[in-house]
């Protein structure tokens, strides 16, 4: 004959433990039912009555089988630099993640506790390592022959254009400006000479770096935040 199935509450056999989704109540000295996710123990079991479970109240939850007297509190509302990727329900906590242009500076088990704006590389610096959900942008100074003229968290250093004749040499924060050696038509006095790039950017003439924008000293990566560009904001 099969062993009789015990219904909760029941006293465990000496040396045995309670079954799955049951717990041992120290006061009743009985195996009793746990409460399912979305519920909590409203009344703990006795020798004659099983656990009475009740639904979690608003703004509280239980994600796991439990025998807790109160549900866990959902985290506070997402801040302005976050988006709610999972709402607070009776069975799950609210999850807040960082909005685009921000990264998680202080994470928690799920979601993010503290978001920070992605660093923007100022002119003369380009992105060495892009930002991720959990790491900031790393900037590097543009190497000779490359430049970045933007304040950006995504732009990398780009090669200077190659000129037959250089009107203005490029530097770390500005592209080279080319001039035409034999203009096909005469220009009106004061006309703007448009750049005349040579077919590819694969080679470059060595520009003369300006010390203020392309320092010759070497930098160790990752760099700390580069000073913000004039008029730049954190967003």
């Amino acid at each position: 004959l099969p062993a009789q199935v015990a219904f909760t509450p029941y006293a465990p056999e000496p040396g045995s433990t309670c079954r799955l989704r049951e717990y041992y109540d120290q006061t009743a000295q009985m195996c009793c039912s746990k409460c399912s996710p979305g519920q909590h123990a409203k009344v703990f079991c006795t020798k004659t009555s099983d656990t009475v479970c009740d639904s979690c109240e608003d703004s509280t939850y239980t994600q796991l089988w439990n025998w807790v007297p109160e549900c866990l509190s959902c985290g506070s509302r997402c801040s302005s630099d976050q988006v709610e990727t999972q709402a607070c329900t009776r069975e799950q906590n609210r999850i807040c993640t960082c909005r685009p242009g921000w990264y998680c500076a202080l994470s928690k088990q799920e979601g993010c506790r503290l978001c920070a704006p992605l660093r923007k590389c100022r002119p003369g610096f380009g992105v060495a390592r892009p930002g991720t959900e959990t790491s900031d942008v790393v900037c590097k100074p543009c190497a000779p022959g490359t430049f970045s003229n933007t304040t950006s968290s995504t732009d990398i250093c780009r090669p200077h254009q190659i000129c037959n004749v250089v009107a203005i040499p490029g530097n770390a924060s500005m592209d080279a400006v080319c001039t035409s050696t034999s203009p096909t038509r005469s220009m009106a006095p004061g006309a703007v000479h448009l750049p005349q790039p040579v077919s590819t950017r694969s080679q470059h003439t060595q520009p003369t770096p300006e010390p203020s924008t392309a320092p010759s000293t070497s930098f160790l990566l990752p760099m700390g935040p580069s000073p913000p560009a004039e008029g730049s904001t954190g967003d």
Epitope: P14, Y24, Q26, K34, P69, L72, N93
Partner: antibody, heavy 128, light 112 residues
């Protein structure tokens, strides 16, 4: 129902020591929540580690105690032990074992509160 | 983690007087998880109150526990010489990644 600790001793810094908590009048091996608490001379109570001796068998450690302290149960001896390694003078204390009167559980995590009974304690002195 | 902060660290009162000990949790906790203990010099701690306000067996009604959230109080009225001891609160809470449990730093009660 009573508890008694043993194994306290005078040891050198860097040594290891195992403390034992023996229960009388109840079984620590099934469905008990047993904890070790220490008290340095003239100081307050500090919770070290707990073990749920029921089906979950889950353990809990104070954040400062992880790594050097290990709590376990001995099924046939009706005891709970605390293994301590790399002892320093800061570990000099009276070590108590206690049983939680109430337990509450969330998933695999168990909280034990209302410690009763307590053992009389065993003194561990770490000195060269 | 959780930090349980007790105030005052020490208090002196006369026989027959009343003493109030506060215990503040660094995080809101269920009153179910709050206990109080009494410890006399050279002795093991003794459970006084559990679930914030329920008296343990044999504890006189002069001891009263109250509070909720982050603020809990132990009140001892009609002080007796035998009440001279250090009192500790204990509390904790659950989160999705664990369970936290700690004692307060203790409050010494001196009876004049």
């Amino acid at each position: 129902q009573s508890l008694e600790e043993s194994g306290g001793d005078l040891v050198q810094p860097g040594a290891s020591l195992t403390l034992t908590c023996t229960a009388s009048g109840f079984s620590v091996n099934v469905n008990s929540y047993m904890c070790w608490v220490r008290q340095a001379p003239g100081k307050g109570l500090e919770l070290i580690a707990c073990i749920d001796t029921g089906s979950g068998g889950s353990t809990w450690y104070g954040s400062w105690a992880k790594g050097r302290f290990t709590i376990s149960k001995s099924t046939n001896l009706n005891t709970v032990t605390l293994q301590m390694t790399s002892l320093t003078a800061a570990d000099t204390a009276t070590y108590f074992c206690a049983r939680a009167r109430n337990t509450y559980g969330y998933g695999d995590y168990v909280y034990g509160g209302a410690f009763d009974p307590w053992g009389p304690g065993t003194l561990v002195t770490v000195s060269s | 983690d959780i930090v349980m902060t007790q105030t005052p660290a020490s208090v002196e009162a006369a026989v027959g007087g009343t003493v109030t000990i506060k215990c503040q949790a660094s995080q809101s906790i269920s009153s179910t998880y709050l206990s109080w203990y009494q410890q006399k010099p050279g002795q093991r701690p003794k459970l006084l109150i559990y679930q914030a306000s329920t008296l343990a067996s044999g504890v006189p009604s002069r001891f009263k526990g109250s509070g909720s959230g982050t603020e809990f109080t132990l009140t001892i009225s009609d002080l007796e010489c035998a009440d001279a001891a250090t009192y500790y609160c204990q509390g904790g809470y659950f989160s999705d990644n664990g369970c936290y449990n700690a004692f307060g730093g203790g409050t010494e009660v001196v009876v004049k």
